[in-house]
């Protein structure tokens, strides 16, 4: 089941998935001046069996300047719902992607890929948050959001990371603690 919405945006933070659940789709987007090859895949799909998961289809881009009688192929609105774009970046936490059964790793880049990736997440997907430069986490609690199915509707849990400016102060019970720890998970909410 695809998640209806994007993972939530929170102030002064970015999010990233460490691994992608089977069923996740990644749009084949090309950078400016390039387009998908004729008859090329619209998206890559994370698929797998009990022992191994991998991305089906390959994204391929070609120069828009190349003479071609076919029109540029772009997904129709129903094929490409607006999704949160995640910039390609290094992982935020040392999560071993390969150790998660039923998940795919971050797909390697393809030639002339767009600078941002558009994922279509599925129920059960978790994304992790990190404060942007110049901000710090107010405490070390869970810094993730999970796409859950509640009352037949998908919903992302509210991330509990609060990123505060360096000038701002808060009261810690003891010494200041490091950012984000994956120990607690805000996913254990009772559904009806």
């Amino acid at each position: 089941e695809l998640c209806d919405d994007d993972p939530p945006e929170i102030p002064h933070a970015t999010f990233k998935a460490m691994a992608y659940k089977e069923g996740t789709m990644l749009n084949c987007e090309c950078k400016r001046g390039f387009r998908r090859i004729k008859s090329g895949s619209l998206y890559m799909l994370c698929t797998g069996n009990s022992s191994h998961s991998s991305w089906d289809n390959q994204c391929q881009c070609t120069s828009s300047a190349t003479r071609n009688t076919t029109k540029q192929v772009t997904p129709q609105p129903e094929e490409q719902k607006e999704r949160k774009t995640t910039e390609m970046q290094s992982p935020m936490q040392p999560v071993d992607q390969a150790s998660l059964p039923g998940h795919c790793r971050e797909p390697p880049p393809w030639e002339n890929e767009a600078t941002e990736r558009i994922y279509h997440f599925v129920v059960g997907q978790m994304v992790y948050y990190q404060c942007v430069q110049g901000y710090r986490a107010l405490h070390r609690g869970p810094a993730e959001s999970v796409c859950k199915m509640t009352h037949g509707k998908t919903r992302w849990t509210q991330p509990q990371l609060i990123c505060t400016g360096e000038m701002e102060t808060s009261q810690f019970p003891g010494e200041e603690k490091p950012q984000a720890s994956p120990e607690g998970r805000p996913e254990s909410e009772t559904s009806c």
């Epitope: 102030p11 405490h139 869970p142 509990q160 607690g184 996913e187």
Partner: antibody, heavy 116, light 107 residues
Framework: EVQLVQSGAEVKKPGESLKISCKGS????????IGWVRQMPGKGLEWMGI????????KYSPSFQGQVTFSADKSTSTAYLQWSSLQASDTAMYYC?????????WGQGTLVTVSS | DIQMTQSPSTLSASVGDRVTITCRAS??????LAWYQQKPGKAPKLLIY???SLESGVPSRFSGSGSGTDFTLTISSLQAEDVAVYYC?????????FGQGTKVEIK
């Protein structure tokens, strides 16, 4: 079902201390910030601040810093708001809320009346 | 602190009317805005978060829009049960702050 249940109404005299409570259920209490919101009689909502029950980190609104104290006991899934010396101007309805950003669940409120 | 100003303070409309409440922030809140409904004698209830995301269980006649500093809550067809005070709240910068409220009445 997610629920925040607050302690009952209180009538106090100026200078007295008070601690009101908010018990969470239906979710992992330690993993969500709990906030407090004040509503004075006939007035609007004021955000007082938040506490993380997992490690008792707090963030107070400057307007309430030093006036109140937040605490939490994760073993009983209960958050507390306390005053060491109440004033008549503390008369208000106090709500606990689940946050930290948009406030998706609210307690029923605790009415605190301070009068000599 | 970011100041939130709502208008009008009171609004009187007929059942079935389209109702609009506005909320203006003293500086940009980047879309980090929520709307709440408080019925008489009750605790507030979340209606909308992140400007336009409808909270689960909230009727679809409620919608939110806006960006930067100017935001709108719209009730497409006012119902008798919508009589309440509506508040906006920014959660871009601590301390989170609320608008002063808009009271919606039935004519």
């Amino acid at each position: 079902e997610v629920q925040l249940v607050q302690s009952g109404a209180e009538v106090k005299k100026p200078g007295e201390s008070l601690k009101i409570s908010c018990k969470g259920s239906g979710y992992s209490f330690s993993n969500y910030w709990i906030g407090w919101v004040r509503q004075m009689p006939g007035k609007g909502l004021e955000w007082m601040g938040i506490i993380s029950p997992g490690d008792s980190t707090t963030k107070y609104s400057p307007s309430f810093q030093g006036q109140v104290t937040f605490s939490a006991d994760k073993s009983t899934s209960t958050a507390y708001l306390q005053w060491s010396s109440l004033q008549a101007s503390d008369t208000a309805m106090y709500y606990c809320v689940r946050g930290p950003y948009y406030l998706d669940y609210w307690g029923q409120g605790t009415l605190v009346t301070v009068s000599s | 602190d970011i100041q939130m100003t709502q208008s009008p303070s009171t609004l009187s409309a007929s059942v079935g009317d389209r109702v609009t409440i506005t909320c203006r922030a003293s500086q940009s809140v980047s879309g980090y805005l929520a709307w709440y409904q408080q019925k008489p004698g009750k605790a507030p209830k979340l209606l909308i978060y992140k400007t336009s995301s409808l909270e689960s269980g909230v009727p679809s006649r409620f919608s939110g829009s806006g960006s930067g500093t100017d935001f709108t809550l719209t009730i497409s067809s006012l119902q008798a049960e919508d009589v309440a005070v509506y508040y906006c709240q920014q959660y871009y910068s601590t301390p989170w702050t609320f608008g002063q409220g808009t009271k919606v009445e039935i004519k």
